[in-house]
Interface confidence: low
């Protein structure tokens, strides 16, 4: 699945011929249970994000909203396949759903991975433009640019994930009782180049889907943090409070992304390096055994974003509250305004910010107040 990782069976490395591999110790119901939990939370949470973004009026949407919506769509399209993967895992890796669903659901995993990462990179760059270069790059951040960038990222994600659609298949590789959903390079690779394809696709996937975007994100947040720190040095006590909160959000965004995806990419890379570096058998076996859990952690990322919004963004909480109690008369009047406020919390367009000198919660702000301080910087 990941899958690979998701990748085909590998026979080549000499070091592996000496390793005593045991039959896969199934995680039992743990991974399937997590998948189902991610499915439930992910569909609800990402559905809620889409609902709050799209129910706000067009004028109130900003350039960042399109990335947030895309992120939710990417996560949502992926999490709906999780019941299939939960079943596959629970059945001890026996795929009963046919070849097309194997191809499609595997494809969606990687489309989600690329689209999510690109959305986060887009949001990070959008934040960078908004905070570090708010005036010079105002034109770059128009809604049209956001739409074009989103279209590009989706096309890119769809193309980069295409090898999975091409090579994934179902087959009974070793016995007659279980059908696996796996990568089959035999149509393009000889025996000797099988591993080269696996390594090539694996390394390029990690580079394009993690290393490069993560480097861009870190660079963006480095300059953002630098700018915020510079501005806040000029602020008084209220500014110090905001500095702590804004910087903590930035740290949480980067750390959450890294925590969820780093184990997957790290273990995958180490496993592939094994053919060159000849890891000790115990370490090689450890990598193989830990990989499903790394995959599981990376999938959890698809349901975390809404919780991060809810935890760090009071306006998103308001929007959720307004939806939850919109049927009650006492909330009915606040429903629309709350979602409008929420829209602003995701926004990044300072060309049409709220009323003069009004910050979060309607606080009066200092004359010297930086233009982005009315916004929450939650981007993941």
């Amino acid at each position: 699945m990941e899958e690979g990782g998701d990748f085909d069976n590998y026979y080549g490395a000499d070091n592996q011929s000496e390793c005593e591999y045991t039959d896969w110790k199934s995680s039992g119901a743990l991974i399937p249970a997590i998948y189902m939990l991610v499915f439930l939370l992910g569909t609800t949470g990402n559905g809620l994000v889409l609902w709050t973004v799209f129910r706000s009026s067009r004028e109130k949407r900003r350039s960042a909203d399109i990335f947030i919506a895309s992120l939710a769509v990417a996560d949502l399209t992926f999490v709906v396949t999780l019941p299939l993967w939960a079943t596959y895992t629970y059945r001890d890796y026996d795929w009963p759903f046919g070849t097309f669903s194997c191809k499609l659901s595997s494809y969606l995993i990687f489309v989600n991975m690329y689209a999510s990462v690109f959305c986060l990179t887009g949001l990070s760059f959008d934040r960078y433009l908004a905070i570090v270069r708010p005036v010079a790059n105002a034109r770059l951040r128009l809604r049209v640019s956001g739409a074009v960038a989103t279209a590009v990222l989706w096309v890119l994600a769809a193309l980069l994930a295409m090898p999975v659609m091409v090579f994934r298949t179902t087959g009974d590789l070793e016995n007659t009782t279980k059908v696996q959903c796996y990568m089959d390079y035999s149509m393009v690779a000889t025996v000797s180049s099988d591993w080269a394809w696996e390594v090539g696709l694996g390394v390029s996937s990690t580079t394009v889907g993690f290393v490069v975007p993560f480097t861009i994100m870190l660079t963006c947040y480095f300059f953002i943090a630098q700018t915020i720190a510079g501005h806040f040095r000029k602020e008084r006590i209220e500014g110090l409070r905001k500095r702590r909160r804004l910087l903590s959000i930035i740290v949480v965004l980067v750390v959450t992304f890294a925590l969820c995806w780093m184990p997957y990419h790290l273990v995958k890379t180490l496993y592939m390096l094994g053919s060159l570096l000849h890891w000790p058998c115990d370490f090689d076996l450890f990598l193989m055994n830990v990989f499903p859990y790394c995959t599981c952690i990376s999938y959890v990322n698809s349901c975390l974003n809404p919780f991060l919004y809810a935890f760090f963004d009071p306006r998103f909480r308001q929007a959720c509250t307004s939806m939850l109690c919109c049927g009650q008369s006492r909330c009915a009047g606040t429903s629309h305004s709350s979602s409008g406020e929420k829209s602003a919390s995701y926004s990044s367009g300072h060309s049409q910010g709220p009323g003069p000198n009004m910050g979060k919660g309607g606080e009066q702000m200092h004359e010297k107040s930086i233009p982005y301080s009315q916004e929450t910087l939650v981007v993941d």
């Epitope: 699945m1 990941e2 899958e3 690979g4 990782g5 998701d6 990748f7 085909d8 069976n9 590998y10 026979y11 080549g12 592996q16 011929s17 390793c19 005593e20 591999y21 045991t22 039959d23 896969w24 596959y88 895992t89 001890d92 890796y93 026996d94 009974d172 590789l173 070793e174 016995n175 007659t176 009782t177 279980k178 696996q180 959903c181 796996y182 990568m183 035999s186 025996v191 000797s192 099988d194 694996g202 273990v267 995958k268 496993y271 990598l287 193989m288 055994n289 990989f291 499903p292 995959t295």
Partner: antibody, heavy 129, light 107 residues
Framework: EVQLVESGGGLVQPGGSLRLSCAAS?????NYWMSWVRLAPGKGLEW???????????YYVGSVKGRFTISRGDAKNSLYLQMNSLRAEDTAVYYC??????????????????????WGQGTTVTVSS | DIQMTQSPSSLSASVGDRVTITCRAS??????LGWYQQKPGKAPKRLIY???SLQSGVPSRFSGSGSGTEFTLTISSLQPEDFATYYC?????????FGQGTKVEIK
């Protein structure tokens, strides 16, 4: 030292039964699939049967299905082949062999197969009246 | 069942010769094939697994190649201890099947 030692062979009449044993040492027996392979006089090697670690999967060549049963006793590090309704064509040297399997981490479940890497010296079964 | 056809069934060669044995599967078996060496009265010994991967401890003069239906075992320079019978084994599907064997004799 990794070692497999077969026993239980002998002379048996057609229609009779025999139970072959294979004692394993030098490796974690419960971690491996195990196989039986035979070599009939003047013929080539023939794979007979194999069994998964926990006994949940067993496979047989068509000519022995319903007559032979492969089993294992992990506590005794032993592999067994119960042979019933023996025929003259079952006459052969029977080898037990260790099967090497692993998993591709990235497909989590796709088994790759190394083949039979450790063999015993064999035990002779003669079916004759 | 997948039939494995080995050729030649026997061959005579001298020490230092390059020897090639082929194995043909009745249907595609990817690279799910191994090569085994057996000497009279001895247990078989695995030389190659997965069509081309050399078993640890086996001299590098042995090599395997092929994928799909055509496979080859090559001994680059025949040594006295290499005179034996060689078998290919497919493990792509059950029942596993061996080739009929190739006996390599001294010329």
């Amino acid at each position: 030292e990794v070692q497999l030692v077969e026993s239980g062979g002998g002379l048996v009449q057609p229609g009779g039964s025999l139970r072959l044993s294979c004692a394993a040492s030098g490796f974690t027996f419960s971690n491996y699939w195990m196989s039986w392979v035979r070599l009939a006089p003047g013929k080539g090697l023939e794979w007979v049967a194999n069994i998964k670690q926990d006994g949940s999967e067993r496979y047989y060549v068509g000519s022995v299905k319903g007559r032979f049963t492969i089993s294992r006793g992990d506590a005794k590090n032993s592999l067994y082949l119960q042979m019933n309704s023996l025929r003259a064509e079952d006459t052969a040297v029977y080898y037990c062999a260790r099967d090497r399997f692993g998993y591709s981490a990235f497909d989590k479940g796709v088994r790759y197969y190394y083949g039979m890497d450790v063999w015993g010296q064999g035990t002779t079964v003669t079916v004759s009246s | 069942d997948i039939q494995m056809t080995q050729s030649p069934s026997s061959l005579s060669a001298s020490v230092g010769d390059r020897v090639t044995i082929t194995c043909r599967a009745s249907q595609g078996i990817r690279n799910d094939l191994g090569w085994y060496q057996q000497k009279p009265g001895k247990a078989p010994k695995r030389l190659i697994y997965a069509a081309s991967s050399l078993q640890s401890g086996v001299p590098s003069r042995f090599s395997g190649s092929g994928s799909g239906t055509e496979f080859t075992l090559t001994i680059s320079s025949l040594q006295p201890e290499d005179f034996a019978t060689y078998y290919c084994l497919q493990h792509n599907s059950y029942p596993r099947t061996f080739g009929q064997g190739t006996k390599v004799e001294i010329k």
